[in-house]
């Protein structure tokens, strides 16, 4: 699966929760970051992600013009400098520091399941999903033979009036 | 090459039903979203409904929800509007058309030529 | 519901001018913008994709820009051929169109 453009074809901000409306939060400590599923109290402020979204072209693509197989991967950097991993062998989802171009680790296969809730599937490990266990991130492998639209792997955007990336 | 075929149209008369189909050709028709698209005569477009890659998510217009029904046939590569009920003001020419990414619902990157439906006594 | 509102409704331009046609969304909707193109007769065809990405072989005097609530449309030079109707079309929380623009030749 190789991305078709260096540059993402477009980028907005995000905060981004569980399809049961738990917030994703992230959290510095000991020098590293580390992710939760939590509700937040009312007026707490919910983090924001950047999506980065790029266009990447199936290797099985039959048509050799480019109509068929053409897929939206994403790229989840809540601070500057710092994206969402997939751990396939922890089975994780890790914050780490990279720099461009980013490993294929840090790149998602963008799944549309409802009109306003998405699931994250791994480019490096097809039919594992960003997923959630135990309040917390995981990656959770999903049989064809399911429906994607299993809860725990959904997740929604909401928008932010924010434009800044802290 | 993309082809997108629309069957079904025709003249019928209000509360009858009619089925339209569109056929899908020259792409991996299980991995995108498949939608209608309708356009009365002299007006503008219209969503009026969409499927998911699988079927197992489907969304409805206001207006038509409990009288059309989206389907698709992977097996057969075709997608299916139900029309039950209708109103002269479903006349129009629908239109199929596919997504633009495997998998996500953005975009209408190829439209069939559409069919024309005219609800009238 | 988001609602998509489009100005002006007709534009009347000469060959070879720069038009520019407006998109307006009631809410944010975060570069999940299209905009297609619709000559008398045809079916719509995709022209711009997420905001600003040229659809595959659209020629490069069409271009698209904006965020948030705000999205133009723009042909830098008017062609015969672009004689037709824009619409713009939104996908981030379901799926609306504009009511078009009509681009004429004076």
């Known amino acids: 699966m190789s991305i078709t453009g260096i540059s993402p074809i477009t980028e907005y901000l995000a905060s981004l929760s569980t399809y049961n409306d738990q917030s994703i939060t992230f959290a510095l400590e000991d020098e590293s970051y580390e992710i939760y599923v939590e509700d937040l109290k009312k007026d707490e402020k919910k983090d924001k992600v950047l999506l980065s979204y790029y266009e990447s072209q199936h290797p099985s693509n039959e048509s050799g013009d480019g109509v068929d197989g053409k897929m939206l991967m994403v790229t989840l950097s809540p601070t500057k400098d710092f994206w969402l991993h997939a751990n396939n062998k922890e089975h994780s989802v890790e914050l780490h520091k990279s720099e461009k171009p980013l490993p294929d680790q840090a790149f998602f296969v963008l799944h549309n399941m409802h009109s306003n809730s998405v699931s994250f599937e791994s480019k490096t490990d097809p039919g594992v999903f960003i997923g959630v266990k135990d309040n917390h991130l995981a990656l959770i492998k999903v049989d064809s033979s399911e429906n994607l639209s299993t809860e725990n792997i959904l997740f929604k955007l909401s928008e932010t009036h924010h434009h800044h990336h802290h | 090459e993309v082809q997108l075929v629309e069957t079904g149209g025709g003249l019928v008369q209000p509360g009858r039903s009619l089925k339209l189909s569109c056929v899908a050709s020259?792409?991996?028709?299980?991995?995108?979203?498949m939608y209608w698209i309708r356009q009365a005569p002299g007006m503008g477009l219209e969503w009026v409904s969409s499927?998911?890659?699988?079927?197992?998510?489907?969304y409805y217009l206001d207006s038509v929800k409990g009288r059309f029904t989206i389907s698709r046939n992977n097996a057969e590569n075709t997608v299916y509007l139900q029309m039950n009920s209708l109103r002269s003001e479903d006349t129009a020419t629908y239109y199929c058309?596919?997504?633009?990414?495997?998998?996500?619902?953005?975009?209408?990157?190829?439209w069939g030529q559409g069919t024309l439906v005219t609800v009238s006594s | 519901d988001i609602q998509m509102t489009q100005s002006p409704s007709v534009l009347s331009a000469s060959v070879g001018d720069r038009v520019t046609l407006s998109c307006k969304a009631s809410?944010?909707?975060?570069?999940?913008l299209d905009w297609y193109q619709q000559k008398v007769g045809e079916a719509p065809k995709l022209l711009i994709y997420?905001?600003?990405n040229l659809q595959t072989g659209i020629p490069s005097r069409f271009s698209g820009s904006g965020s948030g609530t705000d999205y133009t449309l723009t042909i830098s030079s008017l062609q015969p051929e672009d004689v037709a109707t824009y619409f713009c079309?939104?996908?981030?929380?379901?799926?609306?169109f504009g009511q078009g623009t009509k681009v004429e030749i004076k």
């Open positions: 997420f905001t600003n």
């Open positions: 058309a596919k997504g633009r990414y495997y998998y996500s619902s953005y975009s209408f990157a190829y």
């Open positions: 809410h944010n909707i975060n570069k999940h």
């Open positions: 079309f939104q996908y981030n929380s379901g799926w609306t």
């Open positions: 020259g792409f991996t028709f299980s991995n995108y979203w």
């Open positions: 499927i998911n890659n699988d079927g197992g998510n489907t």
